[in-house]
């Protein structure tokens, strides 16, 4: 039994880091493998993660942390029974993938303006809370070419757009994701999408 692709991990910079790797053949990850992880800090415990399958030879493990600070470093040991297959380390602050924003809502009752709001996925005491920027994706269910991205570079989790920038009388969907420049993070996953029917009053044409 050998590791084909070494574990790579990403942290949500809050309480969970996710590690994925591939073995050299079909593996029952939960019965055959154990990933031990330990914060490099005097008298910290070595915790054990039971991995789950992620495709035939792929395994995934969720490492639990109470909190994360930039100096944290974890040792990782991948075991098959008493055989050490791989040894490595992981610094959560250097591999951050933010949590996905939630509660995306489209408010259509503000004159002819669409107001999209969502929730910041972090509590106020988390460092990322004040460092997230967002991308909002809006697309038409009827027309695959009608697909747009709005970059929200301010901190407020909201976006206002004129309803008239979208076609009237058809349904649209929106979703949002986040990233933090300060830690050079990857993008979060997209939030669940929300749907609305876009309609607005066409302005009278004067002749």
């Amino acid at each position: 039994m050998k590791v084909l692709q070494e574990p790579t991990c990403v942290s949500d910079y809050m309480s969970i880091s996710t590690c994925e790797w591939k073995m050299n053949g079909p593996t029952n990850c939960s019965t055959e493998l154990r990933l031990l992880y330990q914060l490099v800090f005097l008298l910290s415990e070595a915790h054990t993660c039971i991995p789950e399958n992620n495709g035939g030879a792929g395994c995934v493990c969720h490492l639990l942390m109470d909190d994360v600070v930039s100096a944290d470093n974890y040792t990782l040991d991948l075991w098959a029974g008493q055989q050490l297959l791989w040894k490595g380390s992981f610094k959560p602050s250097e591999h951050v993938k933010p949590r996905a924003p939630g509660n995306l809502t489209v408010h259509t009752n503000v004159s002819d303006t669409l107001l999209l709001t969502w929730s910041n996925p972090y509590p106020p005491d988390n460092y990322l809370y004040n460092h997230l920027t967002y991308a909002v994706n809006i697309w038409s269910e009827n027309d695959p070419a009608d697909f747009r991205i709005y970059n929200v570079t301010y901190l407020e989790p909201s976006l206002r757009i004129a309803a008239s920038t979208l076609k009237s009388g058809i349904s649209y969907r929106a979703r949002v994701r986040a990233w933090a420049q300060c830690y050079n993070t990857t993008w979060s996953e997209w939030s669940p999408s929300t749907k609305w029917h876009n309609s607005y009053r066409e302005p009278f044409e004067q002749h």
């Epitope: 309480s15 939960s30 914060l39 800090f41 915790h47 639990l64 109470d66």
Partner: antibody, heavy 128, light 109 residues
Framework: EVQLVESGGGRVQPGGSLRLSCAAS?????????MCWVRQAPGKGLEWIGC????????TYYASWAKGRFTISKASSTTVYLQMNSLRAEDTATYYC????????????????????WGQGTQVTVSS | DIQMTQSPSSLSASVGDRVTITCQAS??????LAWYQQKPGKAPKLLIY???TLAYGVPSRFSGSGSGTDFTLTISSLQPEDFATYYC???????????FGQGTKVEIK
């Protein structure tokens, strides 16, 4: 200095109640863990009582004999309690607080494993 | 709950002796076994976890082995400070319970 300090022990009458406290200090705030209680009757072996997860989930595990009369709770990730009710003479023991590692499968299935660091213990005597 | 059967309950040995203590679990606990040393009036001290991993600061004369149901703690060359009581601790992931063995008292011969 990394340490666990128990308090609240003393003499109590049979049928009475007592709440023990455990305060942890010197640990990294990043390290998730369980906080557990273990007791030792005079001249006897060690007996696990139960554990509570110190993170936000707060899940608890108890020895089968401890369910009902003993309750573990937490005020924070660094302070935990052991509430003992309907105490009997056989509950006379030194009660230790211990910090524990865990095994997890996913993010919701987490159980306590070995006890890495122990407090100095607090004595409980149940006697009339 | 699982049961942990530790043997012997006591033993007499001399400084320099090789000492072996065994622990048997009533069900398969993989490698979820730890060993502790306790001296009179003191809290237990972790020696070994995951059946064979030496805890921080523990001398290398202590070693652990085994997996599944049968486990062993070995002291390769007994030192004066090693006279104490030793406990195994088995952890069952099916129930989340932790059970200690009855203890082994290591006395001076």
């Amino acid at each position: 200095e990394v340490q666990l300090v128990e308090s609240g022990g003393g003499r109590v009458q049979p049928g009475g109640s007592l709440r023990l406290s455990c305060a942890a200090s010197g640990f990294s705030s990043s390290s998730a863990h369980y906080m557990c209680w273990v007791r030792q009757a005079p001249g006897k072996g060690l007996e696990w009582i139960g554990c509570i997860y110190a993170g936000s989930r707060g899940s608890t595990y108890y020895a089968s004999w401890a369910k009902g009369r003993f309750t573990i709770s937490k005020a924070s990730s660094t302070t935990v309690y052991l509430q003992m009710n309907s105490l009997r003479a056989e509950d006379t023991a030194t009660y230790y607080c211990a910090r524990a590692a865990f095994v997890n499968r996913g993010v919701s299935w987490i159980w306590p494993y070995y006890f890495s660091l122990w407090g100095q213990g607090t004595q409980v005597t149940v006697s009339s | 709950d699982i049961q942990m059967t530790q043997s012997p309950s006591s033993l007499s040995a001399s400084v320099g002796d090789r000492v072996t203590i065994t622990c048997q679990a009533s069900e398969d606990i993989e490698s979820y076994l730890a060993w502790y040393q306790q001296k009179p009036g003191k809290a237990p001290k972790l020696l070994i976890y995951r059946a064979s991993t030496l805890a921080y600061g523990v001398p290398s004369r202590f070693s652990g082995s085994g997996s599944g149901t049968d486990f062993t703690l070995t002291i390769s060359s007994l030192q004066p400070e090693d006279f104490a009581t030793y406990y195994c601790l088995g952890s069952s992931y099916s129930t989340g319970s932790n059970i200690f063995g009855q203890g082994t008292k290591v006395e001076i011969k």
